[in-house]
């Protein structure tokens, strides 16, 4: 077919020779065709185009990819000739970097059902270059990990050496879907959940006097669960003395915050110190009162049926422990005056 009518887009892939890296091309068919074939899920219901010129099936894999050989030979079907390139729906995945990936890639609908469809195609001119030594030494990795339950960020590798202020506007995609609100070189995630993992693509435009092209980088983001490096901390009791009334019942609560551990063995117990003696107290079972991705807050109470004079001479100690270490908080009872 005649590709002279295809819309053209120029892309640059600068790959690091130090790391494994992938790349993607989206079949960015002109609107409104794009919505019908590939990125229907990028549109809100209010944005559905009024007419859909392609009346083929709604199958999201209804596009065909070709490479245009540089020697002028006929177009080659990607799937037959390039085992390191995989078509996933409307996206072309390059599994290995290399200058041999440079070239022109054309996508168009598989089913041509109307005269309009013939010109419905996109030609992507991809230039692939290894990163020069002069480039930023500490650029962000193409594989980034986010710690579940914590705050994290995803950096665009091709822009990670620039400050936010001098960074150009960035277009981000996650698993092929446009992230319309993200425009900076870094996506900040307030609290990481498992749905934050996926394939992120960041694009920005670079121009010279002759032409402009899109610089693209692909980031594989994993969400990982990290064991805490901190011993538990005691949230309550805060004070080391407590005013009490003799002869009255008393409940002292110990609340402790434990960070995540895959093999979670929290210890929370009360013991009593009386001069040189100390012994563990049999108290009600501990209970979890708050549970988040990051923290588990566990409470255990000590119950005195009635406070005696002897109790005023004792120290009541809450002891908490995880695999990292332990923390204690002691409470001395003091008779309420007046």
């Amino acid at each position: 077919f005649n590709i002279s009518g295809c819309s053209t887009k120029k892309l640059l892939w600068t790959y690091s020779t130090r790391s494994e890296e992938e790349f993607v091309l989206f079949c960015d068919l002109p609107e409104p065709q794009k919505s019908h074939f590939c990125h229907r899920n990028r549109l809100s219901p209010k944005q559905v185009p009024e007419h859909l010129p392609f009346m083929g099936s709604n199958d999201l894999s209804d596009v065909q990819w070709y490479q245009q050989p540089s020697n002028g030979d006929p177009l080659e079907d990607i799937r037959k000739s390039y085992p390191h390139i995989i078509q996933d729906k409307c996206t072309l995945h390059f599994l290995t970097p290399g200058v041999n990936n440079s070239g022109s890639y054309i996508c168009r609908p598989k089913m041509i059902k109307s005269p309009y469809d013939v010109a419905c195609c996109v030609k992507m001119i991809l230039e692939v270059k290894p990163q020069t030594n002069a480039s930023c030494e500490y650029s962000a990795s193409h594989k980034q990990d986010l710690l579940l339950g914590s705050t994290g960020s995803i950096s665009c590798p091709s822009l990670s050496c620039q400050s936010d202020a001098q960074s150009p506007a960035v277009t981000w995609y996650k698993n092929g879907k446009l992230l319309s609100v993200e425009r900076s070189n870094r996506i900040v995630v307030d609290e990481v959940y498992d749905y934050h993992q996926g394939t992120y693509v960041c694009d920005y435009t670079q121009s010279d006097t002759v032409s402009s092209w899109t610089v693209r980088a692909v980031v594989q983001v994993r969400t990982i669960v990290g064991d805490t490096k901190l011993k538990p901390d005691i949230l309550d009791p805060v004070e080391d003395t407590l005013e009490v009334e003799l002869g009255k019942p008393l409940t002292i609560s110990c609340k402790a915050r434990f960070g995540f551990e895959r093999v979670f063995n929290p210890v929370i117990k009360w013991y009593i110190k009386d001069s040189d003696l100390e012994w563990e107290v049999s108290v009600p079972e501990a209970k979890s009162i708050k549970s988040t991705l990051k923290d588990e807050i566990i409470e255990r109470n000590i119950i005195l049926e009635k406070v005696t004079q002897r109790d005023l001479r004792r120290k009541f100690v809450c002891f908490v422990q995880n695999s990292i270490g332990n923390t204690t908080q002691s409470v001395q009872l003091k008779e309420k005056r007046g």
Partner: antibody, heavy 123, light 110 residues
Framework: EVQLVESGGGLVQPGGSLRLSCAAS????????IHWVRQAPGKGLEWVAS????????YYADSVKGRFTISADTSKNTAYLQMNSLRAEDTAVYYC????????????????WGQGTLVTVSS | DIQMTQSPSSLSASVGDRVTITCRAS??????VAWYQQKPGKAPKLLIY???SLYSGVPSRFSGSRSGTDFTLTISSLQPEDFATYYC????????????FGQGTKVEIK
């Protein structure tokens, strides 16, 4: 060291009962989910039942609902699978496995498994 | 209930090959998908959790990814000890069909 040890398997007649035990050590089962997974001879893995003691939750596969009961005694660090009205198709190696169930009980995979106990239902 | 359709059911490969196994969920699921390796007469071993996170101690040649309802386990360069059966498994938070396993993929020596 984390360990799960199943016991209680054996030969039983159709319609009979059996109680499997899963003894846990090296972790606190209260803050874990314990799962029973079975594998019929030459077949794939099939989830049977789960219990999350800290959430007081139990779950069952449709194939065993009403016949099997999962329970846990956290003071003994042991989970149980009471199997009643056993059928020939319940013949399998039964594994107990654990997943973390603290910190919102997010699922991070069945990270520790027992060695399995064989249950044979035959007349 | 959510079904996990695993493919292929078996494959033959050589040491050094790149191997890809896919699981397709019958409906949209969370990323709570895990992959296991099982050798004959042994209990399964966890390889990947949360669709793409490598479990501690598992070699980095194993990786997991997600695209919509498709979950993929990739072994970048097959080693002699990798010949085994692999299972995917999804966990539906607070749903009756809590855990669902794929049918398994047996990786054999070519």
């Amino acid at each position: 060291e984390v360990q799960l040890v199943e016991s209680g398997g054996g030969l039983v007649q159709p319609g009979g009962s059996l109680r499997l035990s899963c003894a846990a050590s090296g972790f606190n089962p209260y803050y874990s989910s314990i799962h029973w997974v079975r594998q019929a001879p030459g077949k794939g893995l099939e989830w049977v039942a789960s219990i999350s003691p800290s959430y007081s939750s139990t779950y069952y596969a449709d194939s065993v609902k009403g016949r099997f009961t999962i329970s846990a005694d956290t003071s003994k660090n042991t989970a149980y699978l009471q199997m009643n009205s056993l059928r020939a198709e319940d013949t399998a190696v039964y594994y107990c496995a654990r997943s973390s169930c603290s910190h919102s009980c997010r699922f991070y995979g069945l990270d520790y498994w027992g060695q399995g106990t064989l249950v044979t239902v035959s007349s | 209930d959510i079904q996990m359709t695993q493919s292929p059911s078996s494959l033959s490969a050589s040491v050094g090959d790149r191997v890809t196994i896919t699981c397709r969920a019958s409906q949209s699921v969370s990323s709570a998908v895990a992959w296991y390796q099982q050798k004959p007469g042994k209990a399964p071993k966890l390889l990947i959790y949360s669709a793409s996170s490598l479990y501690s101690g598992v070699p980095s040649r194993f990786s997991g990814s997600r695209s919509g309802t498709d979950f993929t386990l990739t072994i970048s360069s097959l080693q002699p000890e990798d010949f085994a059966t692999y299972y995917c498994q999804q966990y539906a938070y607070h749903e009756p069909g809590l855990l669902t396993f794929g049918q398994g993929t047996k990786v054999e020596i070519k």
